[in-house]
Every structure is written in structure tokens, then in C-alpha cells.
């Protein structure tokens, strides 16, 4: 699902207040709800009728440093006999997510939000076939 | 997929540098890659064999203010005849994502990262049945 544009309002102070100096804001250390964890089916990526593989990208100047991307294994879906059925399609499910980018020059460290597109998994869909003109 | 704990290292300055004052950091305004957009199959949530509905949660002190959660419509999966088959299960695909929480007292505005669990969609899996005791 998509993240709307910042629109330069969310991160601004109320109009009656002095503006933010130097185009930066105060970000408190620590993460709210840091201990929350996903609770998905075990080996969901292998048991799905639209199975997928995971690829890990790593960047030490990004938080989280590890971002995992899914890729659908097949074009079709896996039927009850374990065979690929191309009358149905395996398609990726994407999500827009935020990460934090770290920028440093010597002892001057600043951070900036970055939008990343993550493919989270795959689902099996009925293909849409448009009529030939 | 899961976001690791901050571990108090990513947001710290190098050891040779003076510590961050008051437990906060500098967050630059603006979002990198803000114009990136998801490119998913149209009506994927209705065409899937594990279809889902979307629920929107809204919070003006969160960025993004709108967070969309998916919920699987069925417990089973939809077969070729359009009937629900409970020998297969529709299961949620979850993603840990970051949002920004805005906290203000008068003209003093600060921000903090928050971890949110988002159900992005659903996929159809073979259920795992463990041995009866």
C-alpha cells in the first residue's frame, strides 16, 4: 500500500511557532513497540500455492540494515498435484515501507527517512485477459 | 519480515565523537525516493484464491497517517469452481514496518520511530497438521 507525500506539513511546527532551524527536526532515540514480532505460518513461502524465495539486501547505513525481498518462484500456481498450473498466476504483493538513512561527515551525523518498495510475498490470482481489438 | 532491535548502535555517533545531547538526533526534512509507488496487479485482493479486504487506520500524529491493514476474507481458499475449500488455508502475510510518531507540547515538537505490524495481503497454503496427542 502506498505512503502519501509528506506535503511539508507533518514535520512542521504549528504556524504560530518559530520555524525549524536548518531544515531538520529532533528525532528521539529508541523505537516504540520495538519488541513486536510477526506471527506468520511457518515456512509460508514454501507451503503457498504461489511460493516465493527471499533475497536479503544489507546496508550498514540504513535502519533496518537488512531488508528482505520476496520473488515468486513460478509464473503459474501450484495445484493439488504439486504441478504448476499456468491458467492461474503467481503475483507479488508489494508494500511501501520507511527506513532510516544515516549520513555522516566526521562527527556530524544526521538521519533521513527513505521510502523503500518491499515485495513481501506472493499470492495466486485469476489472470485478467482483455479482449483483442 | 522482522526488523532487528536498534541495539543502541545505529543511532549513535562514533565512539571518538561527543555523545548525542538529550537522547535525540537530527532528522533531515524530506523523504528520499518519495515518489516511488507500488505496482501491483489490479484488484489483486479480489482476484486472489485467498482474497482479502482492506481496513484503513488513521492517526494524524503518525506518518504515514494512513496505515492499511489486510484481513483474509475466508479461512479456506477459493477453488476453480469459486467455492471455498477448507482443506487449504488463506493465511495473512505480515510485514514489520516503521512509522514516525509526532509528539508535541506547545511549540516543542519531537519525533520518534515506531514499529507497526502490517498485514499486507493473504496467500493460500497447505495447512500443517501436527500429530494428535
Amino acid at each position: 500500500r502506498k505512503i502519501p507525500k509528506v506535503g511539508h506539513t507533518f514535520f512542521q511546527k504549528p504556524e504560530s511557532c518559530p520555524p525549524v532551524p536548518g531544515g531538520s527536526m529532533k528525532l528521539d532515540i529508541g523505537i516504540i513497540n520495538e519488541n513486536q514480532r510477526v506471527s506468520m505460518s511457518r515456512n509460508i513461502e514454501s507451503r503457498s500455492t504461489s511460493p516465493w524465495n527471499y533475497t536479503v539486501t544489507w546496508d550498514p547505513n540504513r535502519y533496518p540494515s537488512e531488508v528482505v525481498q520476496a520473488q515468486c518462484r513460478n509464473l503459474g500456481c501450484i495445484n493439488a498435484q504439486g504441478k504448476e498450473d499456468i491458467s492461474m498466476n503467481s503475483v507479488p504483493i508489494q508494500q511501501e515501507t520507511l527506513v532510516v538513512r544515516r549520513k555522516h561527515q566526521g562527527c556530524s551525523v544526521s538521519f533521513q527517512l527513505e521510502k523503500v518498495l518491499v515485495t513481501v510475498g506472493c499470492t495466486c490470482v485469476t489472470p485478467v485477459i482483455h479482449h483483442v481489438q | 519480515r522482522k526488523i532487528p532491535k536498534v541495539g543502541h548502535t545505529f543511532f549513535q555517533k562514533p565512539e571518538s565523537c561527543p555523545p548525542v545531547p538529550g537522547g535525540s538526533m537530527k532528522l533531515d526534512i524530506g523523504i528520499i525516493n518519495e515518489n516511488q509507488r507500488v505496482s501491483m496487479s489490479r484488484n489483486i485482493e479480489s482476484r486472489s484464491t485467498s482474497p482479502w479486504n482492506y481496513t484503513v487506520t488513521w492517526d494524524p500524529n503518525r506518518y504515514p497517517s494512513e496505515v492499511v491493514q489486510a484481513q483474509c476474507r475466508n479461512l479456506g481458499c477459493i477453488n476453480a469452481q469459486g467455492k471455498e475449500d477448507i482443506s487449504m488455508n488463506s493465511v495473512p502475510i505480515q510485514q514489520e514496518t516503521l512509522v514516525v510518531r509526532r509528539k508535541h507540547q506547545g511549540c516543542s515538537v519531537s519525533f520518534q520511530l515506531e514499529k507497526v505490524l502490517v498485514t499486507v495481503g493473504c496467500t493460500c497454503v497447505t495447512p500443517v497438521i501436527h500429530h494428535v496427542q
Partner: nanobody
Framework: EVQLVESGGGLVQAGGSLRLSCVAS????????MGWFRQAPGMEREFVAL????????GYVDSVKGRFTISRDNAKNTVYLQMNSLKPEDTAVYYC???????????WGQGTQVTVSS
């Protein structure tokens, strides 16, 4: 650990009714889905009915649709299976199952015998 205890099975004539109950207990019980499956002698296990704990959404195998109803009582941590218009082919051991993680039925009861005579 989650414990599931079924009751309500028995011998009934074709066309009769039974109501099975499954009480869930254990540390911090919170299941995604609970359900009933059955196994007749020499047959594969089959899911009969499922219910999502959070919102009560249900699913049934075709052979019991319109005859069986699954329901839950959150306050009592109990799931019920109301079985009407029973047929001899419904004879089986009925097991209660819980999936704390979606699709992973890690917890099972000991089973209750249902016998439908003609």
C-alpha cells in the same frame, strides 16, 4: 502450552443431532483459528469446520454445509459444533484443533467418538 478438551460425542440415529464442545485452556491462550476435523476408520482426516477467533468468520467442508454450525464463546474459550441431520457417513472420531499461527494446527484434543446408526 494449550490444552483442548472435547465433549458431546455419542451414539445417535440418522437424522438426529449432537452438539460437540471444545474448551481451550493454557497459558495466554489466543488462537488465530480453531476448528473441528474428523477421521473415520481407514479414511484420511478431513477438516469439517473452522472459525476465526477474532471475528467469528467460519468455513465448512461441502459435505456438512447447511447441517453443521461452528460457533465460539470467547468468554469461555470454547468452540462448539452443532451437528444436525446427521448421516451414517458422519460417523468418525471428531477432533478439536487450534492454530495459534495461521495454518499451523499445533494443538489438538484427544477426540470424541460420534456414531450415527441407520
Amino acid at each position: 502450552e494449550v490444552q483442548l478438551v472435547e465433549s458431546g460425542g455419542g451414539l445417535v440415529q440418522a437424522g438426529g443431532s449432537l452438539r460437540l464442545s471444545c474448551v481451550a485452556s493454557g497459558r495466554a491462550f489466543s488462537s488465530y483459528v480453531m476448528g473441528w476435523f474428523r477421521q473415520a476408520p481407514g479414511m484420511e482426516r478431513e477438516f469439517v469446520a473452522l472459525i476465526r477467533w477474532s471475528d467469528g468468520i467460519t468455513g465448512y467442508v461441502d459435505s456438512v454445509k447447511g447441517r453443521f454450525t461452528i460457533s465460539r464463546d470467547n468468554a469461555k474459550n470454547t468452540v462448539y459444533l452443532q451437528m444436525n441431520s446427521l448421516k451414517p457417513e458422519d460417523t468418525a472420531v471428531y477432533y478439536c484443533a487450534a492454530a495459534v499461527r495461521p495454518g499451523d494446527y499445533d494443538y489438538w484434543g484427544q477426540g470424541t467418538q460420534v456414531t450415527v446408526s441407520s
